[in-house]
């Protein structure tokens, strides 16, 4: 038999953040290797990660072709050292993944505060727009490009001297908030897709950034502007 000592994969799990999408499974192979196939509900199967001893397969390139489609993957188990034989008609053991719809299910990555700028009693806080691997006309799209107004950001801000938090929301990447003159504030943002009703509707909070911390440094994510 061509599938002697091979066992079907199990615990097939999608891990996806900002559309970077990896299928994981068990077990680590002993006498076998794996090949993954992926398709949409109406499409043909496409093979990826041929005869791999890994227990993961990056399927980003396939799912970004249409992030609103629903995908199904399956993992085939072949004997280790397998060379595809032309005469074998026996189907190797395989296991199906759960269905996966990237637009609805990809996790939102941790956002980053790009800059904040104070003018008088107003502070403009800008959230960095994350790039994804989704393309349109050979151009990579940002998270905002993909989700549009489905994506909002929540800003949490508080005086450095107290713990009482206030919140603001925006469906752009910028906030303009009122602050007390002479007070330093701290900020953290969270990405949210309000239309989702599942655990993945919110990202983790961004790192906290505070006014009055004169780092004087330029970061990859942009400059902090402190105008006092």
């Amino acid at each position: 038999s061509g599938t002697t000592n091979t066992v079907a994969a199990y615990n097939l799990t999608w891990k996806s953040t900002n559309f970077k999408t990896i299928l994981e499974w068990e077990p680590k192979p002993i006498n076998q290797v794996y090949t993954v196939q992926i398709s949409t509900k109406s499409g043909d199967w496409k093979s990826k990660c041929f005869y791999t001893a890994d227990t993961e397969c990056d399927l980003t390139d396939e799912i970004v072709k249409d992030v609103k489609q629903t995908y199904l993957a399956r993992v085939f188990s072949y004997p280790a050292g397998h060379v595809e034989s032309t005469g074998s008609t026996e189907e190797p053991p395989y296991e199906n993944s759960p269905e996966f719809t990237p637009y609805l299910e990809t996790n939102l990555g941790q956002p980053t505060i790009q800059s904040f700028e104070q003018v008088g009693t107003k502070v403009n806080v800008t959230v960095q727009d994350e790039w994804t691997l989704v393309r349109r006309n050979d151009t990579f799209l940002s998270l905002r490009d993909v989700f549009g107004k489905d994506l909002i950001y929540t800003l949490y801000y508080w005086k450095s001297s107290s713990s009482g938090k206030k919140t603001a929301k925006t469906n752009t990447n910028e906030f303009l908030i009122d602050v007390d003159k002479g007070e330093n504030y701290c900020f953290s943002v969270q990405a949210v897709i309000p239309s989702r009703r599942t655990a993945n509707r919110k990202s983790t909070d961004s790192p906290v950034e505070c006014m009055g911390h004169e780092k004087g440094e330029s970061r990859e994510t942009g400059h902090h502007h402190h105008h006092h």
Epitope: I22, E24, K28, I30, A53, D54, T55, D58, A80
Partner: antibody
Framework: QVQLQQWGAGLLKPSETLSLTCAVY????????WSWIRQPPGKGLEWIGE???????RYNPSLKSRVTISVDTSKNQFSLKLSSVTAADTAVYYC??????????????????WGKGTTVTVSS | EIVLTQSPGTLSLSPGERATLSCRAS???????LAWYQQKPGQAPRLLIY???SRATGIPDRFSGSGSGTDFTLTISRLEPEDFAVYYC?????????FGGGTKVEIK
């Protein structure tokens, strides 16, 4: 010869987040799994979790809600974060390479390269 | 979770004697996933045996491993002074990966 060099804060207060990093010298992250293991004082070894070069993770269910293991292939290093620590998290923390070895039609797995260990103490 | 039970907890022997360490699994473990490690005070564990019976690079041939299924054994044919240490078995097949509680081989 592959070597693992690890570092991170050694003294934490309860509720803080433990953060350790392990750098891989003399070899690649690719093709291996990278584990964190800990050993409380005078006790045995406990596996925390592992990560593949592309970022796939496996965690010990007893710690899963508090653990994040990440990888930075550009720096050839991987990291451990353990949130909301208590005195029970006091231990020596080791990073290790989990090697899949192919021989005569099958794979074998073992941890063949270890860091020297970082002592982490949680105390108020 | 696969529980690995090592026995005895402590083995008191003299240099030159034979040491037999046992590792029993709560459910069957493929030998491909079973390894043995040696640990000395203040040091990281060191791989001795993988695949239940294959010696790691640089390990002297006085160390040997055997067994399958749920019962595995590490044997040190003639104890050298540097062999007095704690020995752990480990399985890396089923999450969570687990270690045995260890056997301490001490000088009698």
């Amino acid at each position: 010869q592959v070597q693992l060099q690890q570092w991170g804060a050694g003294l934490l207060k309860p509720s803080e987040t433990l953060s350790l990093t392990c750098a891989v010298y003399g070899g690649s992250l690719s093709g291996y799994y990278w584990s964190w293991i800990r050993q409380p004082p005078g006790k045995g070894l406990e596996w925390i979790g592992e990560i593949g070069a592309s970022g796939s993770t496996r965690y010990n269910p007893s710690l899963k809600s508090r653990v994040t293991i990440s990888v930075d292939t550009s720096k050839n290093q991987f990291s451990l974060k353990l949130s909301s620590v208590t005195a029970a998290d006091t231990a020596v923390y080791y990073c290790a390479r989990d090697t899949p070895y192919y021989y005569e039609g099958g794979y074998y797995y073992y941890m063949d390269v270890w860091g020297k260990g970082t002592t982490v103490t949680v105390s108020s | 979770e696969i529980v690995l039970t090592q026995s005895p907890g402590t083995l008191s022997l003299s240099p030159g004697e034979r040491a037999t360490l046992s590792c029993r699994a709560s459910q069957s473990v493929s030998s491909s996933y079973l390894a043995w490690y040696q640990q000395k005070p203040g040091q990281a564990p060191r791989l001795l045996i993988y695949g239940a019976s294959s010696r790691a690079t640089g390990i002297p041939d006085r160390f040997s491993g055997s067994g399958s299924g749920t019962d595995f054994t590490l044997t040190i044919s003639r104890l050298e002074p540097e062999d007095f240490a704690v020995y752990y078995c480990q399985q890396v097949g089923v999450v969570p990966y687990t270690f045995g509680g260890g056997t301490k081989v001490e000088i009698k």
